[in-house]
């Protein structure tokens, strides 16, 4: 079958890194500079991605594979294949349209990206606040007052995962 297809379509013999050149009697021509073909049998080569501006080159373009970009320091990748770079903020901040802003009281962000999230509401699990939350850190929940009564076990099983709620102010 492969032999038959080759006879019908000479382009199927063109390997990755080449293209089937209609202007030259369908012979396999190497991809020109700044272009690539990652599969065989292609009639054109694709233009290499340019990693410039906020992007920098993680992997150079070759005749058979596209360039791969990441972001300059102070930025992080977003989207498939690092299609965008978003500015880093400090822990305790989130990125808004007007730049990095501190997390509001009652919320935190422990990363350089993403949004500020509400502190865990310990009381939803019948626990008390052991360590107060900050802009950079969530509250730490401790055993409920009942758990601390004489004879009660001091080991609390982990609470099931849930969406964090607002802690009492």
């Amino acid at each position: 079958f492969e032999r038959t297809r080759s006879l019908q379509d000479p382009c199927s013999n063109c390997p990755a890194g080449t293209f089937c050149d209609n202007n030259r009697n369908q012979i396999c021509s190497p991809c020109p500079p700044n272009s690539f073909s990652s599969a065989g049998g292609q009639r054109t080569c694709d233009i290499c991605r340019q990693c410039k501006g906020v992007f920098r080159t993680r992997k150079e373009c070759s005749s058979t594979s596209n360039a791969e970009c990441d972001c300059t320091p102070g930025f992080h990748c977003l989207g498939a294949g690092c299609s965008m770079c978003e500015q880093d903020c400090k822990q305790g901040q989130e990125l808004t349209k007007k730049g990095c802003k501190d997390c509001c009281f009652g919320t935190f962000n422990d990363q350089k990206r993403g949004i500020c999230r509400p502190w865990t509401n310990c009381s939803l699990d019948g626990k008390s606040v052991l360590v107060n939350g900050t802009k950079e850190r969530d509250v730490v929940c401790g055993p409920s007052p009942a758990d601390l009564s004489p004879g009660a076990s001091s080991v609390t099983p982990p609470a099931p995962a849930r969406e964090p709620g607002h802690s009492p102010q």
């Epitope: 500079p33 700044n34 340019q50 410039k52 501006g53 906020v54 965008m84 978003e86």
Partner: antibody, heavy 116, light 107 residues
């Protein structure tokens, strides 16, 4: 001081090619990319592409792909931009510019006139 | 591609006036925004880079602000030599693109 000096004005016929040069001085030529920008009379600035003088790597705007070639001769610190298959709408002033992020130094411009 | 728009396209002002030109990007470009001044028959000249950093040798009456998609060039007190066309440009990603320009002329 940093200077980019471009070649003189050219008059070309439709279908011909033009090669504009840009000689750099006052800095290490291979340290910064050279970009090319054109401006038709009374119009805005149009970015054409870039070249890394160290590696020779280039990147072109899609609309010029296949018609533009950017090269360099590091021994004489000169960048070149060649545009082929010229048409009347390619009549413009062509600028080279050093890229340090922004384009901080520009050549004086080369007027290319395409006329039959 | 990232589109850049500028407003106004032209304005008339007098020496000493405070002039503000705005530039908008079609997507967030963080602070990868530059401003250039161009006079007739001359090459563009870099004024502001990184949205707000003043290029060496540029008078302090020029200032830039903004991040994300909205940017402003301000001339605090217009001087006779400031009558020119001003362009914004994004250097966030290729193809690098310029705004259409704002022509500042004498009232």
């Amino acid at each position: 001081q940093v200077q980019l000096v471009q070649s003189g004005a050219e008059v070309k016929k439709p279908g011909a090619s033009v090669k504009v040069s840009c000689k750099a001085s006052g800095y290490t030529f291979t340290s910064y990319d050279i970009n090319w920008v054109r401006q038709a009379t009374g119009q805005g600035l149009e970015w054409m592409g870039w070249m890394n003088p160290n590696s020779g790597n280039t990147g072109y705007v899609q609309k010029f792909q296949g018609r533009v070639t950017m090269t360099r001769n590091t021994s004489i610190s000169t960048a070149y931009m060649e545009l082929s298959s010229l048409r009347s709408e390619d009549t413009a002033v062509y600028y080279c510019a050093r890229e340090t992020g922004p384009f901080d130094y520009w050549g004086q411009g080369t007027l290319v006139t395409v006329s039959s | 591609d990232i589109q850049m728009t500028q407003s106004p396209s032209s304005l008339s002002a007098s020496v000493g006036d405070r002039v503000t030109i705005t530039c908008r990007a079609s997507q967030s470009i963080s602070i990868y925004l530059n401003w250039y001044q161009q006079k007739p028959g001359k090459a563009p000249k870099l004024l502001i880079y990184g949205a707000s950093s003043l290029q060496s040798g540029v008078p302090s009456r020029f200032s830039g602000s903004g991040s994300g998609t909205d940017f402003t060039l301000t001339i605090s007190s217009l001087q006779p030599e400031d009558f020119a066309t001003y362009y914004c440009q994004q250097s966030y990603s290729t193809p690098f693109t310029f705004g259409p320009g704002t022509k500042v002329d004498i009232k």
